[in-house]
C-alpha cells in the first residue's frame, strides 16, 4: 500500500533504535571515508526529521522518497569533492540516477586501516560510559569496510557484540572472556560479508532471475516438504529483500525481512517442522536463525526425478508452455532431493538440463535425445566431490596454516600477476574452508566447501576488476557465477608469466617480526612464500618446503637469540643465499 510519507512509515515499522542503526549503516556504506561523528550528526538530523513526519505526514518534504532525502543529506556534506573526488559528480544527477551513481562508487577494498579491537579494559570502560555510541562506532566501522554488508544482519551482530560486552565486562578476567567470543562473532560476520557480497554480485551482474534461481535451490534444500508454490513465494520475497539491501534501500530491506520472518513463522505447517525454536526468538535473532535453520527431514516417498523430467513424453511441451516455471520445478525437485549438493552445483545441473532441452526439443525425436541427460550429470557431480575429498585430505594432513600455504602456492602459480597482498588474503580465506567445512559430516561437506569457495572467489574477482592484471583471472571472472569455482580449479601454471627477478630486500627480515601476533607472523611468511613462487613459478613443492622450513628455523633461532638484531643482520643474508641456491 502507498504511504503519504515513506520515512514516517519506515520509522514506525522499524522503531527508533533500528531506524537509526540502519540509517547509520546506509551512510557509512555510501561515504566510507567520513568519520563516525560526521555520520552520527547526519543520522540524528534524519531521525529528527522522521519524527516530524510521524507527527504530521503532510509536513514539508515528508512525501519525498528515501533516496531523495538521503541523497540530499549526503550531497550537503562539506568538502565532498576534496574527500571523495568524482563521487561528488553523483550530486549533479537526479534520482534514481543519483543513487545508482552512489552505488557504483562503493569501494570493496577501501584504504582504511584494519579494524583494531581495543584492549579489554578500555573497551569495557567506553562501553559502560555510552553503550549506544559504542555500538554506533561498531556499525560505522564494519559498514564502511564492508559496503554491501547485509544491514539487518549487521544489526544482529551488533546485538551479539552488545550481549558479549554486557556479560564479559562484569567478569574479573575480561580479556579471556571477551577474546574468544568476539573472535567468534568476527569470524561469522566476515563470512556473512563475503556471502552477501556474492548475492549482490549475482543481482548486479545477472539480475533478479539469477538470484531467484539461487534462492529456489537453497530454500528447496532447507524446506523439502514445502510445495513448489510455497518455495516460489519465499524465493520471490527473499529476492525482493536482497535486491533492496544490495541497492542501498536498507530501511525497506529490513522491514521486508521482518515481514518475511513473520510470514514464515505464521506458516510453519506448510514450510518446515524445524522453525519453532527460531520463531520463539526476538526479531533480529529470529531472522538470523531462520536464515541458517537446519534442513527439514526429506519426505520418504519422493518419486525418482526421471519420471517427470526425462521419461515423460510431455517434457518439451511442458517446457515450451512455461520455460521458467518448468525449469524452476526441475530445480526445486532436484534440490529438495539433494541437501548434500552445493547450490552452485544444483544451478550447474539446472543449466545443463536447460541446455539439453534447448538442443533436444528442437530435434525430431526429443525423448531419444534427452533420455540420457541424468547420466550426463555424473561428471558435473563428480568434479566437486573430488575437489572436496582432495582438499579435505590435504587439510587433515597439513592443518590450516599448511593448507593455506599449499593454496597460496597453487593460486600464485595460476595468477602470478595478481598482487601479493591479494593472493595472501585470498589463500588465507580459501584455506579456512578446511577448518570450516572438512570437520562436518560427509553429507554437509560439499555444500559447505563449494558455496564458501565461490563466495571467496567472488571477492577475488571484485578486487581484480579494479585493476585487471591476469588473463586467467579475467577469463574465470567474466563467466557465470556458478562456473567460476570450477574455472579457477581448472587453471594451471600461467605459462605466459615472466618470472620476477630475485630481490634480496623482499626476503630481508628484522627483529620486529618477533613481537608480532601469530597471525601477522603468518602473513609475513606467506608474503615471502608468494614472492618465492613469483620468482620461481615452477619450483617444486619439495624445493618450496625446504626454503620455508629453513625460513621458519631462521625466525625461530633469531627470535630466541639474546641479540636479535645482530642475529637477523648476520643470518639473514645467509638465508637469502641458501634460498637462491635451493631454487636454482
Amino acid at each position: 500500500e502507498a504511504h503519504k510519507s515513506e520515512i514516517a512509515h519506515r520509522y514506525n515499522d522499524l522503531g527508533e533504535q533500528h531506524f537509526k542503526g540502519l540509517v547509520l549503516i546506509a551512510f557509512s556504506q555510501y561515504l566510507q571515508k567520513c568519520s563516525y561523528d560526521e555520520h552520527a550528526k547526519l543520522v540524528q538530523e534524519v531521525t529528527d526529521f522522521a519524527k516530524t513526519c510521524v507527527a504530521d505526514e503532510s509536513a514539508a518534504n515528508c512525501d519525498k522518497s528515501l533516496h531523495t532525502l538521503f541523497g540530499d543529506k549526503l550531497c550537503a556534506i562539506p568538502n565532498l569533492r576534496e574527500n571523495y573526488g568524482e563521487l561528488a559528480d553523483c550530486c549533479t544527477k537526479q534520482e534514481p540516477e543519483r543513487n545508482e551513481c552512489f552505488l557504483q562508487h562503493k569501494d570493496d577494498n577501501p584504504s582504511l586501516p584494519p579494524f583494531e579491537r581495543p584492549e579489554a579494559e578500555a573497551m569495557c570502560t567506553s562501553f559502560k560510559e555510552n553503550p549506544t555510541t559504542f555500538m554506533g562506532h561498531y556499525l560505522h566501522e564494519v559498514a564502511r569496510r564492508h559496503p554491501y554488508f547485509y544491514a539487518p544482519e549487521l544489526l544482529y551482530y551488533a546485538e551479539q557484540y552488545n550481549e558479549i560486552l554486557t556479560q564479559c565486562c562484569a567478569e574479573a578476567d575480561k580479556e579471556s572472556c571477551l577474546t574468544p567470543k568476539l573472535d567468534g562473532v568476527k569470524e561469522k560476520a566476515l563470512v556473512s560479508s563475503v556471502r552477501q557480497r556474492m548475492k549482490c554480485s549475482s543481482m548486479q551482474k545477472f539480475g533478479e532471475r539469477a538470484f531467484k534461481a539461487w534462492a529456489v535451490a537453497r530454500l528447496s534444500q532447507t524446506f523439502p516438504n514445502a510445495d513448489f508454490a510455497e518455495i516460489t513465494k519465499l524465493a520471490t520475497d527473499l529476492t525482493k529483500v536482497n535486491k533492496e539491501c544490495c541497492h542501498g534501500d536498507l530501511l525497506e530491506c529490513a522491514d521486508d525481512r521482518a515481514e518475511l520472518a513473520k510470514y514464515m513463522c505464521e506458516n510453519q505447517a506448510t514450510i518446515s517442522s524445524k522453525l519453532q525454536t527460531c520463531c520463539d526468538k526476538p526479531l533480529l535473532k529470529k531472522a538470523h536463525c531462520l536464515s541458517e535453520v537446519e534442513h527439514d527431514t526429506m519426505p520418504a516417498d519422493l518419486p525418482a526425478i526421471a519420471a517427470d523430467f526425462v521419461e515423460d513424453q510431455e517434457v518439451c511441451k511442458n517446457y515450451a508452455e512455461a520455460k521458467d516455471v518448468f525449469l524452476g520445478t526441475f530445480l526445486y525437485e532436484y534440490s529438495r532431493r539433494h541437501p548434500d549438493y552445493s547450490v552452485s552445483l544444483l544451478l550447474r545441473l539446472a543449466k545443463k538440463y536447460e541446455a539439453t532441452l534447448e538442443k533436444c526439443c528442437a530435434e525430431a525425436n526429443p525423448p531419444a535425445c534427452y533420455g540420457t541427460v541424468l547420466a550426463e550429470f555424473q561428471p558435473l557431480v563428480e568434479e566437486p566431490k573430488n575437489l572436496v575429498k582432495t582438499n579435505c585430505d590435504l587439510y587433515e594432513k597439513l592443518g590450516e596454516y599448511g593448507f593455506q600455504n599449499a593454496i597460496l602456492v597453487r593460486y600464485t602459480q595460476k595468477a602470478p600477476q595478481v598482487s601479493t597482498p591479494t593472493l595472501v588474503e585470498a589463500a588465507r580465506n580459501l584455506g579456512r574452508v578446511g577448518t570450516k567445512c572438512c570437520t562436518l559430516p560427509e553429507d554437509q561437506r560439499l555444500p559447505c566447501v563449494e558455496d564458501y569457495l565461490s563466495a571467496i572467489l567472488n571477492r577475488v574477482c571484485l578486487l581484480h576488476e579494479k585493476t585487471p592484471v591476469s588473463e586467467h583471472v579475467t577469463k574465470c571472472c567474466s563467466g557465470s557465477l556458478v562456473e567460476r569455482r570450477p574455472c579457477f580449479s581448472a587453471l594451471t601454471v600461467d605459462e605466459t608469466y615472466v618470472p620476477k627477478e630475485f630481490k634480496a630486500e623482499t626476503f630481508t627480515f628484522h627483529s620486529d617480526i618477533c613481537t608480532l601476533p601469530e597471525k601477522e607472523k603468518q602473513i609475513k611468511k606467506q608474503t615471502a612464500l608468494a614472492e618465492l613462487v613469483k620468482h620461481k613459478p615452477k619450483a617444486t613443492a619439495e624445493q618450496l618446503k625446504t626454503v620455508m622450513d629453513d625460513f621458519a628455523q631462521f625466525l625461530d633461532t633469531c627470535c630466541k637469540a639474546a641479540d636479535k638484531d645482530t642475529c637477523f643482520s648476520t643470518e639473514g643474508p645467509n638465508l637469502v643465499t641458501r634460498c637462491k641456491d635451493a631454487l636454482a
Partner: nanobody
Framework: KVQLVESGGGLVQPGGSLRLSCAAS????????MTWVRQAPGKGLEWVSS????????LYADSVRGRFTISRDNSKNTLYLQMNSLRAEDTAVYYC????????SSQGTLVTVSS
C-alpha cells in the same frame, strides 16, 4: 499462452489428398520439434510423424511412410502434413503437438476417408 490450431481436415475419397496445417503461437516455434498424432474413432492415440525445429530431420510411422510428408514454415509459425494416397484407415482426428508429446492439448482436425 501456447496455442496450437489445426485446420485443413475434411471428407476425402480413398486415394485422395489433403494438406493439414497447424498454426502455433505463444512460444518460439523454430526452437521446437513438432509432431502429428492421430486418434481413430474408438482407438488410442497414434504417433504419425515428427520434424525438427529447423525442418532438416523428419520421422514417420511405418503406416504412413511414403504417403505423408511433414514440413514447416518457421517464418509463418506453421506446421504442415501433406497426406497423399489416403486410405480408410487414415480416418481420425489429427492433432499437432510440441516435441515428442503424445497427448494433445488442442481441438484437432477431423479427416474422414470414405467413398
Amino acid at each position: 499462452k501456447v496455442q496450437l490450431v489445426e485446420s485443413g481436415g475434411g471428407l476425402v475419397q480413398p486415394g485422395g489428398s489433403l494438406r493439414l496445417s497447424c498454426a502455433a503461437s505463444g512460444f518460439t516455434f523454430s526452437s521446437f520439434g513438432m509432431t502429428w498424432v492421430r486418434q481413430a474413432p474408438g482407438k488410442g492415440l497414434e504417433w504419425v510423424s515428427s520434424i525438427s525445429g529447423s525442418g532438416s530431420d523428419t520421422l514417420y510411422a511405418d503406416s504412413v511412410r511414403g504417403r505423408f510428408t511433414i514440413s514447416r514454415d518457421n517464418s509463418k509459425n506453421t506446421l504442415y502434413l501433406q497426406m497423399n494416397s489416403l486410405r480408410a484407415e487414415d480416418t481420425a482426428v489429427y492433432y499437432c503437438t510440441i516435441g515428442g508429446s503424445l497427448s494433445p492439448s488442442s481441438q484437432g482436425t477431423l479427416v474422414t476417408v470414405s467413398s
